[in-house]
């Protein structure tokens, strides 16, 4: 394959290639810029289906459309996990599966998709207007969540089309990491573009087809994403609420776990609160929450004691640290 990079700088281009070359040097950065802006946005799809055989039985299928490695999948109903939703199953690629009634069988379908069968009987059974959410934690993208529910007019056996409506619960580390790399790449690309534009071509004939390139708007938000900043946070109130008490059907894998330190060696950064930034909904339920673990406003006031190396005679409530509320 022949690329312009192989042409020595001082050598005149081959006849006939001059215009094409100028055109291609302009097109390539634009293609790369487009890739820059659109890269790193994985999606989660959710499909909810009512079984034809058992009218109160549901099958939820979820998938992750992204390049990262999945570290955890959480399926919940009644809303997103930790925000009014009740966890039905947690699936870990190595550690196994943990599920709770009315979840009957949770399993991995592929490396990036799972399915969950819910049995419906008794107080904890789902109903047609229940919202089911799937949250995929992956590296380096962060956590992404989408929710879906069975359409009101669904016949048994029919399924709702997969709803790739990501809640974009992006963990700070994942988002900043990927964005940082992409931003750096795009800025560097722009820098090269400008350098290329302002550098005089040595001993080359002036190009006949080199219109003035428009200034690249790197990372300019689209109208959709600009409008997103003004969309209110949408939640779905379902009349069918999950039971607040249920029994477990554990399918735990091997128990291994990151060591909890026995004492503080240093003062780490505290957990970041989720900063809610809504985005426009393409599916039934969409919100954006960016942060590490906490959802803003969920920590009760005057809760945790602070982790500190120094004794404080005023007691734990007086201390500040990553474990408590400042």
């Amino acid at each position: 394959m022949r690329t312009e990079a192989q042409v020595p700088a001082l050598q005149p281009p081959e006849p006939g290639l001059e215009g094409a070359m100028g055109h291609r040097t302009l097109v390539l950065p634009w293609v790369l810029l487009t890739l820059c802006v659109t890269a790193g946005t994985p999606e989660v799809w959710v499909q909810v289906r009512m079984e034809a055989t058992e009218l109160s039985s549901f099958t939820i299928r979820c998938g992750f459309l992204g390049s990262g490695s999945i570290s955890l999948v959480t399926v919940s109903w009644g809303g997103p996990n930790g925000a009014g939703g009740t966890t039905l199953a947690v699936l870990h690629p190595e550690r196994g599966i943990r599920q709770w009634a009315p979840a009957r069988q949770a399993r991995w379908e592929t490396q990036s998709s799972i399915s969950l069968i819910l049995e419906g009987s008794g107080a904890s059974s789902p109903c047609a207007n229940t919202t089911f959410c799937c949250k995929f934690a992956s590296f380096p993208e962060g956590s992404w969540e989408a929710c879906g529910s069975l359409p009101p007019s669904s016949d048994p056996g029919l399924s709702a089309p997969p709803t790739p409506a990501p809640i974009l619960r992006a963990d700070l580390a994942g988002i900043l990491g990927v964005s940082g790399v992409l931003l750096f790449g795009c800025v560097y690309l722009l820098h090269l573009l400008r350098r290329h534009k302002h550098r005089p071509a040595p001993r080359l004939q002036p190009s006949r087809t080199s219109p003035q390139a428009p200034r690249a708007r790197a990372w300019a938000p689209s109208q959709a994403s600009q409008a997103a900043l003004h969309v209110p946070y949408a939640t779905i109130n379902t009349s069918c609420r999950p039971a607040t008490l249920d029994t477990a059907h554990p399918h735990g894998g091997p128990s291994w776990w990151a060591s909890l330190p026995t004492h503080a060696a240093h003062r780490p950064q505290g957990p970041a609160a989720w900063a809610s930034t809504p985005i426009p909904a393409r599916g039934s339920f969409v919100s954006v929450e960016n942060g590490l673990y906490a959802q803003a406003g969920e920590r009760p006031p005057h809760t945790g004691p602070g982790l500190t190396l120094f004794p404080d005679p005023r007691g734990p409530r007086a201390m500040e640290g990553p474990l408590g509320v400042r």
Partner: nanobody, 127 residues
Framework: HVQLVESGGGLVQPGGSLRLSCVAS??????????MAWFRQAPGKGLEAVAG???????TYADSVKGRFTASRDNAGFSLYLQMNSLRAEDTAVYYC???????????????????WGQGTMVTVSS
């Protein structure tokens, strides 16, 4: 709104046993934290991680309590227990239950992300 309520603290003689309990309750939904952990704070000392257990049942312990304390969770996933045996005077502290979620389901180091905390229960080991 999530609440953690500890119970089971009290006065016990050295070598004795106690069982602490912690229940996570939420208004309107069932909250199953990915991680639930016990921390303690002795009088005039800093906070110390005692034990943690994640959603898959994986446990970890501080060196000072290994072999004497056992952390467990109920099947439903929202209650945490700490069985304390062979108690010593240095185990005297306020014991706090903490809970929270992490991206990979594990208990995060140093307690980051454990956003919910109980008010604490006092354990006194004295003869």
């Amino acid at each position: 709104h999530v609440q953690l309520v500890e119970s089971g603290g009290g006065l016990v003689q050295p070598g004795g046993s106690l069982r602490l309990s912690c229940v996570a309750s939420a208004s309107g939904f069932t909250y199953r934290p990915y991680c639930m952990a016990w921390f303690r704070q002795a009088p005039g000392k800093g906070l110390e991680a005692v034990a943690g257990i994640d959603i898959f049942g994986g446990t970890t312990y501080a060196d000072s309590v290994k072999g004497r304390f056992t952390a467990s969770r109920d099947n439903a996933g929202f209650s945490l227990y700490l069985q304390m045996n062979s108690l010593r005077a240095e185990d005297t502290a306020v014991y706090y239950c903490a809970a929270g979620d992490s991206p990979d389901g594990r208990c995060p180091p140093l307690g980051q992300g454990l956003n919910y905390w109980g008010q604490g229960t006092m354990v006194t080991v004295s003869s």
